[in-house]
């Protein structure tokens, strides 16, 4: 005979799901299907990652997002996992917000970004609701410097990169110190490959560092590079 | 070929000084910082300071307020004091010649890779 | 102070491809060099100014370095690799050499 009144609680169908914390009355619900849209927007050695949610939320407001990197070597082909030597805008598992920006990412690398959708009972089932995107980082390379010249007042310093990457770049930045001084440093920029550095102090060294500006912002900046410039007995004006 | 050369007490008690010389054969002394660096067992390596011919020194900050390193150019030696020495100072210490001359036609190489070392002394620090 | 980070381990088979990591802020702007040290032996420079191999070192040890990872990648790996490897740089900041914390490296 049938009961005078409905049950308390439903078994759930196959397929949905509740959570430990989910109140008997609560309807039955399922894990979210994929992020909708990802895009990955790649700003030199920058990607930003954006998406939209789930088209189907498995009837739940608790959905969390997480992102995961895999970055590949383009020579070998070879890939590997890259949490640690990228950097997130904020911690990127648990997240509420649909964008995050990742940085320090290395020139000439491939990498892969993977956002999953996980809601309360996401943890009751093996699949994985994900998106996947993945992008090049074409930042331009770091300049190669060398010290043409000096003399007991300046030191003369050219630079390169390689040619196709030479029309991305609108001007370099020269940033330099005196060796040991960590509290003051000057900064120059110029649109050619070379400077002369002036009004420096004789027998000293400076550090020196060069760094391309381009569109989408700093280009990878050179090595720090240690010139001295000449002391006052031994010099022959910019001889190196 | 640059050779290596290092001696010194391998025993000392807590509060004592350790005292180690490292002597250069071959090669342009005047032309290179020399390192000492050192290494407890089962751990990882740890700079401890440098000289160069003249006595111009740059030191491990950590280690900075113990160390005395000096050199004596007419044999083409350099060495390392550590004062005040306890057992956490038990360890192999090594010294250290730089790959290339510190400066060369104005472009310079602090903290250069190291290419040839000392063959390393055990210094146990027991009471 | 400048601080650099390598992981404590890292496991190969035998002809395989390993690559051990040195992290540190910034370090694609400083000169990074390698060492390989074998028990009861000092160390030996195996590569140096990130990607140069001195004379005498095989060229199945290679390295890499930008952003804020350096790598050092041993191809065709062989039971003679498994040693502890260190990654060694001098911070301009504060004026002195900073060693990483050294990775062993297992042959399987």
């Known amino acids: 005979l049938p009961s005078p009144e409905g049950a308390t609680s439903c078994e759930c169908e196959e397929g949905f799901f509740r959570a430990p914390q989910d109140p008997a009355s609560m309807p039955c619900t399922r894990p979210p299907s994929a992020p909708h849209y990802l895009t990955a927007v790649g700003m030199g050695a920058k990607v930003e990652l954006r998406w939209t949610p789930p088209q189907d939320s498995g009837g739940r407001e608790d959905i969390v997002y997480s992102v995961t990197c895999e970055q590949c070597w383009p020579e070998s082909g070879e890939c590997g996992p890259c949490e640690a030597s990228v950097r997130y805008s904020e911690p990127p598992h648990g997240l509420t917000r649909t964008s995050v920006t990742v940085s320090d990412l290395e020139p000439h690398m491939n990498y892969t970004f993977t956002v999953e959708a996980r809601n309360g009972v996401s943890g009751l089932v093996t699949s994985r609701s994900f998106r996947t995107a993945s992008v090049s980082i074409n930042q331009t390379e770091p300049p190669k410097v060398r010290l043409e010249g000096r003399s007991t007042t300046s030191l003369s310093v050219s630079w390169s990169i390689p040619p196709p990457q030479q029309s991305r770049v609108w001007k370099y930045e020269v940033t330099y110190r005196k060796k040991g001084d960590s509290n003051s440093y000057n900064v120059r920029r110029t649109e050619g490959f070379s400077v002369t550095l002036d009004d420096l102090a004789p027998d000293t060294t400076y550090l020196v560092q060069v760094q391309a500006l381009t569109q989408e912002g700093q280009g990878a900046g050179s090595k720090v590079h240690e010139f001295q410039t000449l002391s006052p007995e031994g010099s022959g004006n910019l001889a190196v | 070929q640059v050779q290596l050369q290092q001696w010194g007490a391998g025993l000392l008690k807590p509060s004592e000084t350790l005292s180690l010389t490292c002597a250069v054969y071959?090669?342009?002394?005047?032309?290179?910082?020399w390192s000492w660096i050192r290494q407890p067992p089962g751990k990882g390596l740890e700079w401890i300071g440098e000289?160069?011919?003249?006595?111009?020194?740059s030191y491990n900050p950590s280690l900075k307020s113990r160390v005395t390193i000096s050199v004596d150019t007419s044999k083409n030696q350099f060495s390392l004091k550590l004062s005040s020495v306890t057992a956490a100072d038990t360890a192999v210490y090594y010294c250290a010649k730089p790959f290339r001359p510190h400066c060369t036609n104005g472009v310079c190489y602090s903290g250069d890779a190291f290419d040839i070392w000392g063959q390393g002394t055990m210094v146990t620090v027991s009471s | 102070s400048y601080v650099l980070t390598q992981p404590p381990s890292v496991s190969v088979a035998p002809g395989q491809t390993a690559r051990i990591t040195c992290g540190g802020n910034?370090?694609?702007?400083?000169?990074v060099h390698w060492y390989q040290q074998k028990p009861g032996q000092a160390p030996a420079l195996v590569v140096y100014?990130?990607?140069d191999r001195p004379s005498g070192i095989p060229e199945q040890f290679s390295g890499s370095n930008s952003g804020n990872t350096a790598t050092l990648t041993i191809s065709r790996v062989e039971a003679g690799d498994e040693a502890d490897y260190y990654c060694?740089?001098?911070?301009?900041?504060?004026?002195?050499?900073?060693f990483g914390g050294g990775t062993k490296l297992t042959v399987l």
């Open positions: 060694q740089v001098w911070d301009s900041s504060s004026d002195h050499l900073v």
């Open positions: 910034n370090i694609g702007s400083k000169n």
């Open positions: 071959g090669g342009s002394f005047n032309d290179y910082y």
């Open positions: 100014d990130d990607s």
């Open positions: 000289v160069n011919h003249s006595g111009s020194t």
